[in-house]
Amino acid sequence: ESLGWDIAELQLNHTGPQQDPRLYWQGGPALGRSFLRGPELDKGQLRIRRDGIYMVHIQVTLAICSSTSTSRHHHPTTLAVGICSPASRSISLLRLSFHQGCTIASQRLTPLARGDTLCTNLTGTLLPSRNTDETFFGVQWVRP
Amino acid sequence: ESLGWDIAELQLNHTGPQQDPRLYWQGGPALGRSFLRGPELDKGQLRIRRDGIYMVHIQVTLAICSSTSTSRHHHPTTLAVGICSPASRSISLLRLSFHQGCTIASQRLTPLARGDTLCTNLTGTLLPSRNTDETFFGVQWVRP
Amino acid sequence: ESLGWDIAELQLNHTGPQQDPRLYWQGGPALGRSFLRGPELDKGQLRIRRDGIYMVHIQVTLAICSSTSTSRHHHPTTLAVGICSPASRSISLLRLSFHQGCTIASQRLTPLARGDTLCTNLTGTLLPSRNTDETFFGVQWVRP
C-alpha cells in the first residue's frame, strides 16, 4: 500500500432524498465486484486519502430507459462529478448530459488531495439503474 | 514483465455465427496498433494470465450507422463485457445499449483472476465496424 | 520523472481557423486542473516525449447543444484523435460521431513514440464547449 496504489470501484447504493441530487455509493467484496483500497466512503460519498493525480471514471445508466423515455422529460438529465468538500476546493470535474441516450460514461485525469470528497450529482427526475454492470464509479491513483 | 504490467489492446476480427453473440478479437503489431503483453487470445476471446485489478475498456461502433438506422431495428443493440469462463466465475462486468447512437464506449476497474476469459457479447442484429479506430477492446493490469 | 510517469490533462483553448479542423489545447495549474508532466504542447497540439504504451482519453461536448441541434446539421460532427506528425506515423487512433448526442467520450491504449504529435480533429460546423468539465483531453504513460 505504501506505493500509493489507492484505488476504488463503487456500485450504486441509493439516490438521495428529493432535494439532494447526490448518488450514494457502496463498495466491498461482499457486495459483488466493488472495492475500496485506500479511499473510503463517508455517508456514501468517496473520500480521498492520498494526494496525487487520479483517473476518475464513471458510468451511469438510467433505469428502465429507452431513447424515447429520455426525450419525454422536459428537464435534461445531467451527471456531474465534482469535489464537494472541503468547500474551499469545491469544483465540477466532469459533466455529461443524457440527451436521447440512456447511459453516460466518461473518465478523466485530475489532481486530488487527501480529504477531498467526491460527489456525483444526478439532476433531473429519472432514477438510475442499480445494476452493477450498468452503474459504477471509480478512482485510481496514477502518480504523485 | 515480472512487475505484472499485463496489458492488451485488441481489434475486431469477426462476429460469431448467428446464434453466437460474441465478438471475436485479434491482436498483434502486424495487424496495426493492437497488442498482447501478458494476456492471451483463445479462439478470439481474451484470457487473463495474472491475478489483479484491471482497467477494462471498450469501444464498439456499428457499421455504416446513423442515428436513424439504429432506430429502424426492433431489438435494442446491447454490448456486454463479462467473464464467460470458468463458468463458476461467470458474470457481466459492463453493459451498454446503443439506443439512438452508433457508438458505445466505457471503462471500469474490476478484479480478474488468472484463467478468466472475457467475452464481449453484442446482442441485436447490427454488424459492428471493423475499423481499428472505431472498435477496440483492452485491459490493463493496475495493481495486485 | 525517470520512472516514465509521463502524463497530461488538457483543456480546450480554441478551435482552428475555418479550414483547420484541429482543436487547440492548453494546460497548466494556472488555468485550472489541467497539467503537463512530461508531454509538451506545440502550438496547441500535444507532443509525446517518451516512448511507451499510453492510455489516451478524451471528452468533447458541443456548445449550447441539445439532441435536436445535432440532428439539424446535415454533416455529421465527428471527433478523431490521431498522430498527425511525423507524417510517416500519421494514423487515426480513435474516432467517434456525435449523431443525436452532444458529448462523446472514450479512451484507448496505444503505443506512442517520442516526437509523436497528437491531433484532435473535430469535423462539422458545431462549436465545442470550453467548459473544463465538459471538454478535456489527456494521456497517461502506462508501460514501456
Epitope: - | A63, I64, S71, R72, H74, H75, T125, L127, R130, T132 | -
Partner: antibody, heavy 120, light 111 residues
C-alpha cells in the same frame, strides 16, 4: 424453413394501383426487414423500398410519391402498394428478406415474384 | 446513387474452366472495415439467389467453386471449375447506402 409467398394481380390498368401481399413463414417480421424490388428488361433489377423490423419504411426517391409499404407482423404479412401505374411499370415484382445482419442489406431469401403487366 | 457497371455482359465458358465477372462501382462501397458488395445468381423464371455477401463471404449452402474478391470500387466473382448448372445471369449489388443498386447482369453460357 424460410419462405416468402407473393400474391397479387397479373394485369393492371394504366393509372390504377398495384397491391401485392408477401406472406412469410419461418421467421418473424419483428426481427427481419423485407425489401421490395422489380425487374424489367429495360431497367434491370431496381430496389423500390424496405420495411424495417420496427415498421419504419425507406423508399427509393424515384418512387417515394407512389409507394407505400406496411405490414401486419402478427399475420406475417407485408403489403406493397404502388399507385398511378404506367406501361413502363410492367415488370416482375419481388419481396426479399434482409439477411440476419440488419445493416448488411443483402437478400438471403426471395419471393417467387409477381409478374405485372400494365396495359389497357 | 451508386452506379454498378458489370463486365462482360455475357461470356461463354467451357465446363471445368474459370469464369470471371467484374463489377465496378461509381464510388467506394467499402466502409467500417467491410466491402458492401454482394453477388447473386438468377436462372430464368426464378428469383435471384444470394451467392456471396460482403465481397468474399460464401452464403450458406453455396459451393466453394464460387468466390468473390475486391475492395473499394473494383470487385470480381470467380467460378471455378464451371459446372453444368452454373449457366445463369449473375448480378452484383451494393449496400453501402440507400438506394441499393444492381449491376446490369452478366449472362454466363456454357460452350
Amino acid at each position: 424453413q424460410v419462405q416468402l409467398q407473393q400474391s397479387g394481380p397479373g394485369l393492371v390498368q394504366p393509372s390504377q394501383s398495384l397491391s401485392i401481399t408477401c406472406t412469410v413463414s419461418g421467421f418473424s417480421l419483428t426481427t427481419y426487414a423485407v425489401h421490395w424490388f422489380r425487374q424489367s428488361p429495360g431497367q434491370g433489377l431496381e430496389w423500390l423500398g424496405v420495411i424495417w423490423s420496427t415498421g419504419i419504411t425507406d423508399f427509393n426517391a424515384a418512387f417515394i410519391s407512389r409507394l407505400n409499404i406496411n405490414k401486419d407482423s402478427s399475420k406475417s404479412q407485408i403489403f406493397f402498394k404502388m399507385i398511378s401505374l404506367q406501361p413502363n411499370d410492367t415488370a416482375i415484382y419481388y419481396c426479399g428478406r434482409n439477411s440476419y445482419y440488419g445493416n448488411l442489406y443483402a437478400m438471403d431469401y426471395w419471393g417467387q415474384g409477381t409478374s405485372v403487366t400494365v396495359s389497357s | 446513387d451508386i452506379v454498378l457497371t458489370q463486365s462482360p455482359t455475357s461470356l461463354a465458358v467451357s465446363l471445368g474452366q474459370r469464369a470471371t465477372i467484374s463489377c465496378r462501382a461509381s464510388k467506394s462501397v467499402s466502409a467500417s472495415g467491410y466491402n458492401f458488395m454482394h453477388w447473386y445468381q438468377q436462372k430464368p423464371g426464378q428469383p435471384p439467389k444470394l451467392l456471396i455477401y460482403l465481397a468474399s463471404n460464401l452464403e450458406s449452402g453455396v459451393p466453394a467453386r464460387f468466390s468473390g474478391s475486391g475492395s473499394e470500387t473494383d470487385f470480381t466473382l470467380n467460378i471455378h471449375p464451371v459446372e453444368e448448372g452454373d449457366a445463369a445471369t449473375y448480378y452484383c449489388q451494393h449496400s453501402r447506402e440507400l438506394p441499393l443498386t444492381f449491376g446490369a447482369g452478366t449472362k454466363l453460357e456454357l460452350k
